[in-house]
Amino acid sequence: PGPPPGPPRVSPDPRAELDSTVLLTRSLLADTRQLAAQLRDKFPADGDHNLDSLPTLAMSAGALGALQLPGVLTRLRADLLSYLRHVQWLRRAGGSSLKTLEPELGTLQARLDRLLRRLQLLMSRLALPQPPPDPPAPPLAPPSSAWGGIRAAHAILGGLHLTLDWAVRGLLLLKTRL
């Protein structure tokens, strides 16, 4: 062993990382809420819309207390990755009517990508099991019509909103355990 190393270069502590992840998730939640409202204004939703390919909501707020850190982060990352793919798909195959949601959809996609990288780094710093960030997934079929694309957008933004709301609560709770 040689001489002691000089002062280490400083990167964020996991707890600080968790703080900034919460801030990013809150900001993404606000973006999603705003975009969903914009979509409702332009194309009012006739009832609830579902998309079979979307993940089911991870957890009710009441059941959060029993969650463990690895489970929350793994599930959250898997769900957000699915939403990222759906947003990409929406931008690519959603049709001309959804072009009115640009550049906001593009910003949402970039922030979602950033949040996923944050979660990956957090899991790495904590040395938690790390499922592959980009697992292979079957391609999503294009919407059957323009209205199908709009219905899909309602479902995607609505589901993402619920997931991010759950994520903020979950991450704040986890911070108390770290």
């Epitope: 502590d13 850190l69 990956q120």
Partner: antibody, heavy 114, light 111 residues
Framework: EVQLLESGGGLVQPGGSLRLSCAAS????????MHWVRQAPGKGLEWVSV????????YYADSVKGRFTISRDNSKNTLYLQMNSLRAEDTAVYYC???????WGQGTLVTVSS | QSVLTQPPSASGTPGQRVTISCTGS?????????VHWYQQLPGTAPKLLIY???ERPSGVPDRFSGSKSGTSASLAISGLRSEDEADYYC???????????FGGGTKLTVL
């Protein structure tokens, strides 16, 4: 200032055992996963083992599986590596490292020779 | 043999820009895991240089930058200085090993 200080290295015969320790200070030890990484003389870095922030997950490189055991004591801010059935090819400087790893100690030399 | 492949050596003159490549596979870099870079000055312990593909810890000059694409990554050093002479290692998580893997290291010589 972040400090990781390894100890417990030395000369040991093939088949023997050693226990390395790493004392951490200057950061929240219990919030970081911890690694052992080694470097044989004149060679590159080789990851040995990792333990999660709370000790619930432990992983090992194939080359040390079944012979080495990683553990930690968060109340003492200390990381350990119990090395059994040592072989000549385990001769290296052993570094303890925190996080990604973000922070590294200065290393302790383990020599396995008869 | 290392799981991540790096050129054993690289060189450049002061002020030049040099890049060091790091090639992995579908179980590490190609699976989407982040790449980290370390600098090991002669006789000292490694230090984190770049994390999460292109993030610099505070204290690392912006002459150092990282990028990642597909199954490979690269480290770029611009405005090369004599104090940059060191060994550089890339690392990424590997899902088949359940741990990080390192490249074999690149010895950078400043001519």
């Amino acid at each position: 200032e972040v400090q990781l200080l390894e100890s417990g290295g030395g000369l040991v015969q093939p088949g023997g055992s050693l226990r390395l320790s790493c004392a951490a200070s200057g950061f929240t030890f219990s919030s970081y996963g911890m690694h052992w990484v080694r470097q044989a003389p004149g060679k590159g870095l080789e990851w040995v083992s990792v333990i999660s922030y709370d000790g619930s997950y432990k992983y090992y490189a194939d080359s040390v599986k079944g012979r080495f055991t990683i553990s930690r004591d968060n109340s003492k801010n200390t990381l350990y590596l119990q090395m059994n059935s040592l072989r000549a090819e385990d001769t290296a400087v052993y570094y303890c490292a925190a996080g990604v790893p973000d922070y590294w100690g200065q290393g302790t030399l383990v020599t396995v020779s008869s | 043999q290392s799981v991540l492949t790096q050129p054993p050596s690289a060189s450049g003159t002061p002020g030049q820009r040099v890049t060091i490549s790091c090639t992995g596979s579908s179980s590490n870099i190609g699976a989407g895991y982040d790449v980290h870079w370390y600098q090991q000055l002669p006789g000292t312990a490694p230090k984190l240089l770049i994390y999460s593909n292109n993030e610099r810890p505070s204290g690392v000059p912006d002459r150092f930058s990282g990028s990642k694409s597909g199954t490979s990554a690269s480290l770029a050093i611009s405005g090369l200085r004599s104090e940059d002479e060191a060994d550089y290692y890339c690392a990424a998580w590997d899902q088949s090993l359940n741990g990080p893997v390192f490249g074999g290291g690149t010895k950078l010589t400043v001519l």
